[in-house]
């Protein structure tokens, strides 16, 4: 008896690998036997030359060559995506539509995300060669080659994880040239060759000198502050250096820097900072208004040095980035005493040459300002009548006055003469910070 069509075999996702045709299967039941029609991305296929599709009597679709590809930026398709095929089976009782099957083409791009780097490892210690393969469809697998031959992975000693090769315990025999190979059905790509040198462990308490390495610190440049770092960024410099020496360069570089002391003075200790670069890097954590000495030291495992030449850089003074602390107002005899503590040292941004004190002005004290020179941290202001006295204090460097303190106010509730005669438990005044 007659029955509507039913899809028995749905087309499957496929990778077009050529050179032969790709086949998409579709089988349907129904009475009368249904006719099969194919659609690509919802559009019926004409099957008329030059259309590269051909329909076999059993309903199988042959794709003789890949159709024109979508563009990578059409919001829908990478250039690997040839489209979604569906088949329709129809008779007079109805139509059945199959699941969609995606046809794609194999691709392997050329650019590695991460290339393995030359390195020096120490016998018995762990080391890692990093590799990030190019984009590929299907996703490529990574294998490692050593000295032109596939690396025989030893369980417990070698691990390949996320493309990277982890060597649990370096042996002298691990020395050689390593290459990462990315492979998929489109082919394979080879990374650059990375030279791995293996050193014997040293028993010295002092780090071993990398005597063969020569390092020249070429440039120290003050970086423009990043506006995204806010209105008061700490200074940073850009160090660039050149290395000459053996085939295996250092694994890391450390900046050594210190503030320059007066000639003949005892040098400050060198601060150390690991640098994120092999020829140049940013170094932060500095202070404005200081003269700095910089040098760079290479290291590999426990081996290190020698240090580069020393370069000098004077960082300009900036205005202090914090106000004086603990500003207080105290009543005197016909005067008010203002005292404060300097801003924290890391906010000086230079040499503090003095302080600026402002009165905010009201009925008791007209607007005014005073300059306190040198290291003095107090000021006496004459008062003539009861009322409110409010002041702010700012530290001054060669670049000018910095951020003022929050206003501090003293309320003199009665004339000073009475205040001295009748002291109460709290005094005749109140201190408030606005």
């Amino acid at each position: 008896q007659d029955s509507p069509p039913q899809i028995l075999v749905h087309p499957q996702d496929q990778l077009f690998q050529g050179p032969g045709p790709a086949r998409m299967s579709c089988q349907a039941s129904g009475q009368p036997p249904p006719t099969i029609r194919w659609l690509l991305n919802g559009q019926p296929l004409s099957m008329v030359p030059p259309d590269p599709h051909h329909l076999l009597p059993d309903g199988t679709l042959l794709l003789l060559q890949p159709p024109a590809r979508g563009h990578a930026h059409d919001g829908q398709a990478l250039s690997t995506d040839l489209g979604v095929y569906t088949c329709e089976a129809s008779n007079r009782l109805g139509t059945a539509v199959s699941r969609g099957a995606r046809l794609s083409v194999a691709v392997l791009r050329e650019d590695f995300q991460i290339q393995p780097r030359d390195m020096v490892a120490v016998v018995g210690e762990q080391f890692t060669l990093e590799c990030g393969p190019p984009w590929g469809h299907p996703e490529p697998t990574v294998s490692w080659w050593k000295d032109g031959k596939p690396l025989a992975l030893q369980p417990g000693r070698h691990t390949v994880s996320g493309g990277s090769l982890l060597m649990a315990r370096a042996e002298k025999s691990d020395e050689g040239t390593y290459m990462c190979v990315a492979t998929n059905s489109a082919g394979h790509r080879e990374s650059r060759a990375a030279r791995v040198s293996i050193q014997e462990p040293q028993d010295y308490t002092e780090p071993v000198e990398l005597l063969a390495v020569r390092i020249q610190l070429e440039n120290v440049t003050l970086l423009n502050p990043d506006p995204a770092e806010g209105p008061k960024p700490r200074p940073a410099v850009w160090l660039s250096w050149k290395v000459s020496g053996p085939a295996a360069p250092a694994q890391s570089y450390t900046a050594l820097f210190r503030t320059q002391t007066a000639p003949g003075g005892q040098g400050a200790p060198w601060a150390e900072e690991l640098l994120a670069g092999w020829q140049s890097a940013e170094l932060g954590g500095l202070h404005w208004g200081q003269d700095y000495e910089f040098k760079v030291r290479p290291s590999s495992g426990r081996a290190r040095g020698p240090d580069s030449n020393v370069l000098l850089l004077r960082l300009p003074e900036k205005v202090p980035s914090a106000p004086p602390q603990e500003v207080t107002l105290k009543p005197g005899n016909g005067t008010v005493f203002v005292s404060w503590v300097p801003p924290p040292a890391e906010n000086h941004n230079g040499i503090i040459r003095g302080y600026q004190v402002w009165s905010l002005g009201n009925t008791s004290l007209p607007p005014a300002n005073w300059t306190v020179v040198g290291e003095q941290t107090q000021l006496e202001i004459a008062t003539h009548m009861p009322g409110s006295y409010c002041v702010q204090v700012a530290a001054v460097t060669g670049a000018g006055a910095g951020e003022p303190s929050r206003p501090v106010c003293l309320l003199l509730e009665q004339a000073m003469e009475r205040a001295t005669q009748e002291p109460s438990e709290h005094g005749p005044w109140t201190l408030e910070q606005l």
């Epitope: 990578a72 930026h73 990478l78 050329e110 650019d111 995300q113 990030g132 469809h137």
Partner: antibody, heavy 118, light 112 residues
């Protein structure tokens, strides 16, 4: 139409953990590499993580390496970012974005805010 | 890491006039295969970033042809031939040649 919708943001204490999700639709998720990018208030954009289309290869900057893990579930068309040992400086709007090969981020989600504060 | 810098950081523009933003990298963005992965994005106020230019000079679909990108090595430029009101926002360059990928600090474009 390509759509990316992030979720899972919120307030968390320093040292705490959070898991962000990004639901993808309108494209074949399993053929695209994906990334997370963040933007701290008033600051520049910062790349946080990238994962290959099959999830085998992952990439991170040093600032999050060892603390953040990017992963994906291609059956659910979802991208994840597991964030552990959170710090105040991780406070940002986190965006998920689709990658064309490893060449460029073409579509971005609307972002989800993560605040790390005690 | 590659440090990206942009100039100017703020760009007041006149409607209908051209505008130009520079992006510099601390190392060449051309890789060993000769490919350069430098992209430009616009982040309009309160929105997510949107792609304008990929691989130095290719306009993304739907991006008006008044936007163009150029450059090589370490110096790159985004040009807007005639600024329109909808072009205001922060423009970022992004390099994806070297891991870690890094953005520029952004250039804020607004109408005079």
């Amino acid at each position: 139409e390509v759509q990316l919708v992030e979720s899972g943001g919120g307030l968390v204490q320093p040292g705490g953990s959070l898991r962000l999700s990004c639901a993808a639709s309108g494209f074949t998720f399993s053929t695209y590499a994906m990334s997370w990018v963040r933007q701290a208030p008033g600051k520049r954009l910062e790349w946080v993580a990238t994962i290959s289309q099959g999830g085998t290869y992952t990439y991170y900057p040093d600032s999050v390496k060892g603390r953040f893990t990017i992963s994906r579930d291609n059956a659910k068309n979802t991208l994840y970012l597991q964030m552990n040992s959170l710090r105040a400086e991780d406070t940002a709007v986190y965006y998920c974005a689709r990658l064309i090969y490893y060449d460029y981020l073409d579509y971005w989600g609307q972002g989800t805010l993560v605040t790390v504060s005690s | 890491d590659i440090v990206m810098t942009q100039s100017p950081l703020s760009l007041p523009v006149t409607l209908g006039e051209p505008a130009s933003i520079s992006c510099r990298s601390s190392q060449s963005l051309e890789n060993s295969n000769g490919n350069t992965y430098l992209n430009w994005y616009l982040q309009k106020p309160g929105q997510s970033p949107q792609l304008l230019i990929y691989r130095v000079s290719n306009r993304f679909s739907g991006v008006p042809d008044r936007f163009s990108g150029s450059g090589s090595g370490t110096d790159f430029t985004l040009k807007i031939s005639r600024v329109e009101a909808e072009d205001v926002g922060v423009y970022y360059c992004l390099q994806v040649t070297h891991v870690p990928w890094t953005f520029g600090p952004g250039t804020k474009v607004d109408i005079k």
